[in-house]
């Protein structure tokens, strides 16, 4: 099968919706950055479609994306991170649609990890801690985190807490006794860089102690 688009193919292509969205991840692999794009319409026939980025690059004019199933991505050190790049969907040598995007405004941080919850009996609270790879990064260092927790039986009743540190204290009296809770965390850029929420961290599950009847306090687990 030829990679050329026949005229008929181009005419058909022009009827399609080639809307796409992208996100960048900075210093995702050492000093390498990544840029990931995908079509918003999952039914687009991507067989001969390619993505290309031009402008605001170091040493090169343009870079081509690699294709992995429905996802198009670049891993490179060559993003200037100043000014807008032109990202185009191409078939053959024809550009079907382009977007001018500043890669610093579409940053998706890496998901937080090592989420854990420790019960402090004396303080009657739970200390929630987690880690983020962004503490070691040169660019996207400042993040806002969204900690979400729920009682396991409450399907969609999530309580959200926004914080800029990686430590949160949950008061025991705010939680139901003798209940299983699920907690997770995600991050979003919060200073200079803009963009999207990261993926959620893996969930952590913890149980609250029962109430000690004589003191009115919960029993430790």
């Amino acid at each position: 099968e030829s990679g050329y688009a026949q005229n008929g193919d181009l005419e058909d292509a022009e009827l399609d919706d080639y809307s796409f969205s992208c996100y960048s991840q900075l210093e995702v692999n050492g000093s390498q950055h990544s840029l990931t794009c995908a079509f918003e319409d999952p039914d687009v026939n991507i067989t001969n479609l390619e993505f290309e980025i031009c402008g605001a690059l170091v040493e090169v004019k343009c870079l081509n994306f690699r294709k992995l199933q429905e996802i198009y991505f670049i891993e490179t050190k060559k993003f200037l991170l100043i000014g807008k790049s032109n990202i185009c969907v191409k078939v053959g040598e024809k550009s079907l649609t382009c977007k001018k995007i500043d890669l610093t405004t579409i940053v998706k941080p890496e998901a937080p990890f090592d989420l854990s919850v420790v019960y402090r009996e004396g303080a009657n609270d739970f200390v929630v801690t987690f880690n983020t790879s962004h503490l070691q990064k040169k660019y996207v260092k400042v993040l806002m985190h969204d900690v979400a927790y729920r009682q396991e039986k409450d399907e969609n009743k999530w309580t959200h807490v926004n914080l800029s540190s990686t430590k949160l204290t949950l008061l025991q009296r705010k939680l139901q006794p003798a209940a299983m809770y699920e907690i997770k965390v995600r991050s979003i850029p919060d200073h200079y860089f803009k963009g999207f929420w990261s993926e959620w961290s893996p969930s952590y599950y913890f149980r609250t102690p029962e109430i000690n009847n004589s003191s009115g306090e919960m029993d430790p687990i």
Partner: antibody, heavy 119, light 107 residues
Framework: QVQLQESGPGLVKPSETLSLTCTVS?????????WNWIRQPPGKGLEWIGY???????TYTPSLKSRVTISRDTSKNQFSLKLSSVTAADTAVYYC????????????WGQGTTVTVSS | DIQMLQSPSSLSASVGDRVTITCLAS??????LAWYQQKPGKAPKLLIY???RLADGVPSRFSGSGSGTMFTLTISSLQPEDFATYYC?????????FGGGTKVEIK
């Protein structure tokens, strides 16, 4: 201006190890790009051997992987090729070149060095 | 491995002729293709990258077209210095592979 220059012995005995060095000027091998070795047997086409990435990671062609090591010395701005257990089939002009990985080209090449495997 | 089938393996042409060399990839490689020119005793020289983009300092009589599996290098008006061997190369997947070459000779 980026320049690459291969060096090493022109004659290697069968079963021994071929060792070549590529000295780079005008660009640091630890700044960016992949740093490649390519060879061309007499009268034949080009064969990519492998690269060392600016970060130090390496990728080799599967057919030579068991015999190839590419390393670097950032203090001298050099990268090197070692090919063990050579035979006459390894007789070729060996080139070093910059590029690949996130770019689809080799833009700078060394002039090449001829290595003959013979007893 | 992705096979790069280059044709013809050799051709004879005159100064001023339009010359076309094709490269067929055994699977789709998008725009991950480069063309090189090699003269006897010299290293290859980059002509075209990303299938269609002209490398710096390369005369505009050279052009590249195609994407996916079928690629073409065209020399619009052959000059005396263009008699050489031409190679295509894919960077889409490891191992990176070259075509077998096309030798352009004087008729």
């Amino acid at each position: 201006q980026v320049q690459l220059q291969e060096s090493g012995p022109g004659l290697v005995k069968p079963s021994e190890t071929l060792s070549l060095t590529c000295t780079v000027s005008g660009y640091s091998v630890s700044t960016d790009y992949a740093w490649n070795w390519i060879r061309q047997p007499p009268g034949k086409g080009l064969e990519w051997i492998g690269y060392i990435f600016y970060s130090g990671s390496t990728t080799y062609t599967p057919s030579l992987k068991s015999r190839v090591t590419i390393s670097r010395d950032t203090s001298k701005n050099q990268f090197s090729l070692k090919l063990s257990s050579v035979t006459a089939a390894d007789t070729a002009v060996y080139y070093c070149a910059r590029g690949g990985y996130d770019v689809n080209y080799f833009d700078y090449w060394g002039q090449g060095t001829t290595v003959t495997v013979s007893s | 491995d992705i096979q790069m089938l280059q044709s013809p393996s050799s051709l004879s042409a005159s100064v001023g002729d339009r010359v076309t060399i094709t490269c067929l990839a055994s699977q789709t490689i998008g725009y991950w293709l480069a063309w090189y020119q090699q003269k006897p005793g010299k290293a290859p020289k980059l002509l075209i990258y990303a299938a269609t983009r002209l490398a710096d300092g390369v005369p505009s009589r050279f052009s590249g077209s195609g994407s996916g599996t079928m690629f073409t290098l065209t020399i619009s008006s052959l000059q005396p210095e263009d008699f050489a061997t031409y190679y295509c190369q894919q960077f889409f997947s490891y191992p990176w592979t070259f075509g077998g070459g096309t030798k352009v000779e004087i008729k």
